[in-house]
Amino acid sequence: CKAMHVAQPAVVLASSRGIASFVCEYASPGKATEVRVTVLRQADSQVTEVCAATYMMGNELTFLDDSICTGTSSGNQVNLTIQGLRAMDTGLYICKVELMYPPPYYLGIGNGTQIYVIDPEPCPDSDF
């Protein structure tokens, strides 16, 4: 069976600054040189693309300049960081990996990481 398995943590809690990081790991059935990683958000049965990046093995992940995602790669592992998260962004974040080149193409989709985001309490006014 030449399928591609993608693993990611079940739950991640975003920091008070609205930053969440998780690892997306894939078991490559072939020797890919070009990989595309997409983060999908699923909430209320709606699916939206959060960000996507294509990278050459051994090189850094490059997301678009206006992307809320950053990441680094090491072998078959991608370390993803999503920034600017607010409580309304709580949801299931799914890692989708595609081995683009060389042929054959392979698709792998993780089970998703539930990211919980809690908006920080506003600081109380002080007399100081």
């Epitope: 030449k2 399928a3 591609m4 080149y101 054959p104 698709l107 792998g108």
Partner: antibody
């Protein structure tokens, strides 16, 4: 709304060429891989080709490799299929289809008929 | 290349009956979809990931299975369900379809 509309089909002689187009609307075209699938009269579905995202990666079915070329113009939200050295067995309805977020073909065009006959 | 074999070729049933369609793969597949096609129309995605219903698909359609054996079930056939159904694997290239099962009115 989200849709794909094919055009360019027609009757052509064996050995000649034809170019099909597929106009996309209602979604961010450059974020999706797009396929061509064909269906010979009274037959089943046959995958033909795919082009991914920015157009740098393309895959073809063995039956069309070396004769057909898939391309896309993201600025025009349009997919193309250049068909050369056409054969009678290429006669079919040609559909373009979007590979959705999960990979399955979630949006299809209405199809355009290509008839290769002398 | 993964070969998908659908059975039966034709299924003759009456409205209200249950339809069970089979799709068998020549090797294990991770990603399988089901499509419905009516005469003169383009295919329509019903099920992806073997068991997830596509947007807007009625819950009388359900998919199950894993590995090499997959099933599409239509719990109660409506008049508009009489059509040809195709399975497809999409987890690796080349993408392949089954030969189709025709569900016709008995």
């Amino acid at each position: 709304q989200v849709q794909l509309v094919e055009s360019g089909g027609g009757v052509v002689q064996p050995g000649r060429s034809l170019r099909l187009s597929c106009a996309a609307s209602g979604f961010t075209f450059s974020s999706y891989g797009t396929h061509w699938v064909r269906q010979a009269p009274g037959k089943g579905l046959e995958w033909v080709a795919v082009i991914w995202y920015d157009g740098s990666n393309k895959y073809y079915a063995d039956s069309v490799k070396g004769r057909f070329t898939i391309s896309r113009d993201n600025s025009k939200n349009t997919l193309y299929l250049q068909m050369n050295s056409l054969r009678a067995e290429d006669t079919a309805i040609y559909y373009c289809a979007r590979a959705g977020n999960w990979g399955a073909f979630d949006i299809w065009g209405q199809g355009t008929m290509v008839t290769v006959s002398s | 290349e993964i070969v998908l074999t659908q059975s039966p070729g034709t299924l003759s049933l009456s409205p209200g009956e249950r339809a069970t369609l089979s799709c068998r793969a020549s090797q294990s597949v991770s990603y399988l979809a089901w499509y419905q096609q009516k005469p003169g129309q383009a295919p329509r995605l019903l099920i992806y990931g073997a068991s997830s219903r596509a947007t807007g698909i009625p819950d009388r359609f359900s998919g199950s299975g894993s590995g090499t054996d997959f099933t599409l079930t239509i719990s109660r056939l409506e008049p508009e369900d009489f059509a040809v159904y195709y399975c497809q694997h999409y987890g690796s290239s080349p993408w392949t379809f089954g030969q189709g099962t025709k569900v016709e009115i008995k």
